[in-house]
């Protein structure tokens, strides 16, 4: 059974959710990778991908997505800015390697957007939001549709578990052959 | 709880190096990067450059390419941090500090109680 | 280069409210965190995510976000909260700003 891990992130609407993804260096460098949406039932979809070949440090736009690839660092940079309630959800980052399927990169991020300022006692949400216009998309790149020969298993519940501390981790064991076919719309 | 011990106070001489260590502990030393950051006399915090404890990859700031040099041995969850051709400005006290998340590169929650490095002749 | 922009000095009466801007380029997509280096310590982290507090930091440390303006409040300013400050966010490299220090008067 592979164990997967997320992080959890709450944030208010109009922040920014800022997170890596670390890959193997010598091995995806150039890769095409991708943000994905995993929804309950359903297989996971493609939001943004970077260009074919992934382009250092090269900014991909998609709406309020905004990926960038640092190849001499090996990692994935994902932003989603002015954030909206309806962002929440569970995400990952996969790398695309046809003929095979798409590989996961650990961690996947759980992602809770709540309106507005937080107003009650002891809250650490102790500020108002930041609504930020973002600039005109600059690069879309194309991301691949990916068919898979064998059938999606459907993704993992929506943890229960309270994850209060931001070193907390949900830990979801005995999820085996998940399949990571990215979709459009 | 997480630990960060870094390695005892050093004086050098201008042209030599330094090593300082940062031992890890109370947490999967692997799952999270680990930054160097600086602080001379009278000035303000300066970030060296980060680990990735995991890869062995280092990504350092562009005014310490070239003479910093940053690994990790896992088998004993320590972090080092290596400054050569050290000059009187690179007198300092040096943290090292880790990521609040594995899936972040900032915020430092977590910091070394620093070294000092003196350089002089 | 990226830089982040602090005011070098802010003074406050005790019990009045301070407050410590840091502004850069595009600061309005990035994520940013505030620390506080008070002589012979090292830094700990006050605001993270603009306005999220860690745990065990006083209430009175707040932090907010308009345009690409970042700012720290420190409500009802206490003698030991004289420090120096700093403003982080993470560009291609991890930035700081040139530090504030905060004196209590």
């Known amino acids: 059974a592979t164990k997967l891990t997320e992080e959890k992130y709450e944030l208010k609407e109009g922040q920014t959710l800022d997170v890596k993804c670390d890959y193997t260096l010598e091995k995806f460098a150039s890769s095409q990778k991708a943000w994905q949406i995993i929804r309950d039932g359903e297989m996971p979809k493609t939001l943004a991908c970077t260009e074919r070949p992934s382009k250092n440090s090269h900014p991909v736009q998609v709406g309020r997505i905004i990926l960038e690839d640092y190849h001499d660092h090996g990692l994935l940079r994902v932003r989603m800015v002015n954030l909206q309630v309806e962002d929440s959800g569970l995400y990952q980052c996969v790398i695309y390697q046809p003929p095979k399927e798409p590989h996961m990169l650990f961690d996947r991020i759980r992602l809770v957007v709540t309106k507005g300022f937080s107003g009650t006692p002891g809250s650490n949400e102790n500020s108002t939001q930041n609504v930020y216009k973002i600039p005109p998309t600059t690069t879309k790149a194309l991301c691949p549709l990916y068919t898979s020969p064998r059938t999606v298993t459907q993704a993992p519940p929506k943890s229960t578990a309270d994850v209060s501390t931001p070193d907390s981790e949900i830990n979801l064991t005995n999820v085996t052959d998940i399949i990571r076919v990215p979709v459009f719309n | 709880q997480v630990q960060l011990v870094q390695s005892g106070a050093e004086v050098k001489k201008p042209g030599a190096s330094v090593k300082v260590s940062c031992k890890a502990s109370g947490y999967t030393f692997n799952g999270y990067y680990i930054h160097w950051v600086r602080q001379a006399p009278g000035q303000g915090l300066e970030w060296m450059g980060w680990l990735n404890p995991n890869s062995g990859g280092a990504n350092y700031a562009q005014k310490f390419q070239g003479w910093v040099t940053m690994t990790r041995d896992t088998s004993i969850s320590t972090a080092y941090m290596e400054l050569s051709r050290l000059t009187s400005d690179d007198t300092a006290v040096y943290y090292c500090?880790?990521?609040?998340?594995?899936?972040?590169?900032?915020?430092?929650?977590?910091w070394g109680q620093g070294t000092l490095v003196t350089v002089s002749s | 280069s990226y830089e982040l922009t602090q005011p070098p000095s802010v003074s406050v009466s005790p019990g009045q409210t301070a407050s410590i801007t840091c502004s850069g380029d595009k600061l309005g997509e990035r994520n940013v965190s505030w620390y506080q280096l008070k002589p012979g310590q090292s830094p700990i982290l006050v605001i993270y995510?603009?306005?999220k507090r860690p745990s065990g930091i006083p209430e009175r440390f707040s932090g907010s976000k308009s345009g690409n303006t970042a700012i720290l409040t420190i409500s009802g300013t206490q003698a030991m909260d004289e420090a120096d400050y700093y403003c982080?966010?993470?560009?291609?490299?991890?930035?700081f700003g040139g530090g504030t220090k905060l004196t209590v008067l």
């Open positions: 500090a880790r990521d609040q998340r594995k899936t972040t590169v900032t915020p430092f929650e977590y």
């Open positions: 982080q966010a993470w560009d291609r490299n991890v930035v």
């Open positions: 995510q603009d306005n």
